[in-house]
């Protein structure tokens, strides 16, 4: 799951999220794993234009951040997280209503596909900024 | 809508241990990976931070009451609870149990008042 | 542990007028400040997390600014419900700490 490198981030979509000349870990388990993540990224994007002012620029670092995930290089490249109190903060106060909507419709079954699923992180799995700070990315 | 409600006696004496309980209604402890806190005001005062603890039981204690704090949670109740020992008249204040959403405290419960008295 | 300071401690302002609270940290905390209303007998409730944004169903006359050790928070109209106590406070460490609470007062 974890098996891949570090590379300068070279696409468009996260350009003005990711810090300039940023390490990202390209995930070795994608034939192309530039193409696809930038793929990942750029649909959950369209979904983005919809929302309101205050969650958009808030979940556009928190998708950008989660897929395209700071490498921290190494004889085994590792990617870092974002920290658990970022995801929380996104989803239940920068983009609460918009979150709420969005897990109604999966439970309904309305997405045509599973990709959105795999662009946003599940909080509760993500290391904690308080317990070690270097664990995790803080935005 | 998440509901905190704390319970426990409102009256203790000097040198006993405090004991409090904060039962959550409207979600699950153990879903969303929040911190569960106690938050303590002292009358006429400022806001001061106890403690939290994570539903798998990790907690984390204000390095100034350490020594006699002790928080647990028990999942299958919705509770998470306070222990203060050894008290004093210093720590008479209302106790409020709150929820921590990573970058702000999003839900309280209404506080109770304890006073350490004789 | 980080301080925050809150000015003034009291305050007292008539309903219509523009009022502004500042809170300075002894530190750092990035943006990772919120504010808080408390009214007698009551909890504090939030209004304004990561330092600007606006609580869900929060009057817009309530905003925040500010990062790093300075921050403001400013309410442009007051209204007769807003008189209060507001409290700043940074997660941007352990421990959380507060400030020492800003009590708005009916002139």
């Known amino acids: 799951d974890n098996k891949g490198y570090c590379a300068q981030y070279r696409g468009e979509v996260c350009n003005a999220v990711l810090a300039k000349d940023a390490l990202v870990f390209l995930n070795t388990s994608y034939a192309d794993p530039e193409e696809a993540q930038e793929l990942l990224v750029h649909t959950a994007w369209n979904e983005l234009k919809v929302v309101s002012p205050v969650c958009r620029p808030a979940a556009e670092a928190l998708l950008c951040n989660h897929i395209f995930q700071e490498c921290s290089p190494g004889v085994v490249p590792t990617p870092i997280p974002i920290c658990r109190e970022y995801c929380l903060a996104v989803k239940e106060l920068f983009c609460a209503k918009e979150w709420l909507v969005m897990e109604e419709k999966t439970h309904r079954g309305l997405y045509r596909s599973e990709m959105h699923l795999l662009s946003v992180p599940e909080c509760s799995k993500l290391p904690s900024m308080h317990w070690d700070p270097t664990a995790c990315a803080r935005l | 809508q998440v509901q905190l409600q704390e319970s426990g006696p409102g009256l203790v004496k000097p040198s006993q241990t405090l004991s409090l309980t904060c039962t959550v209604s409207?979600?699950?402890?153990?879903?969303?990976?929040?911190?569960w806190n106690w938050i303590r005001q002292h009358p006429g005062k400022g806001l001061e931070w106890i403690g939290y603890?994570?539903?798998?039981?990790?907690?984390y204690y204000n390095p100034s009451l350490k020594s006699r704090v002790t928080i647990s949670v028990d999942t299958s109740k919705n509770q998470f609870s306070l222990k203060l020992s050894s008290v004093t008249a210093a720590d008479t204040a209302v106790y409020y149990c709150?929820?921590?959403?990573?970058?702000?405290?999003?839900?309280w419960g209404q506080g109770t008042l304890v006073t350490v008295s004789s | 542990d980080i301080q925050l300071t809150q000015s003034p401690s009291f305050l007292s302002a008539s309903v219509g007028d523009r009022v502004t609270i500042t809170c300075r940290a002894s530190?750092?905390?990035?943006?990772?400040l919120a504010w808080y209303q408390q009214k007698p007998g009551k909890a504090p409730k939030l209004l304004i997390f990561?330092?600007?944004a606006l609580q869900s169903g929060v009057p817009s006359r309530f905003s925040g600014s500010g990062s790093g050790t300075e921050f403001t928070l400013t309410i442009s109209s007051l209204q007769p419900e807003d008189f209060a106590t507001y409290h700043c406070?940074?997660?941007?460490?352990?421990?959380?700490?507060f400030g020492q609470g800003t009590k708005v007062e009916i002139k």
């Open positions: 709150a929820r921590e959403v990573g970058i702000a405290f999003d839900y």
């Open positions: 409207g979600g699950s402890i153990s879903s969303g990976g929040h911190y």
């Open positions: 603890i994570y539903y798998s039981g990790t907690t």
């Open positions: 530190q750092g905390v990035s943006s990772y």
């Open positions: 990561a330092a600007s």
């Open positions: 406070q940074q997660l941007n460490s352990y421990p959380p700490t």
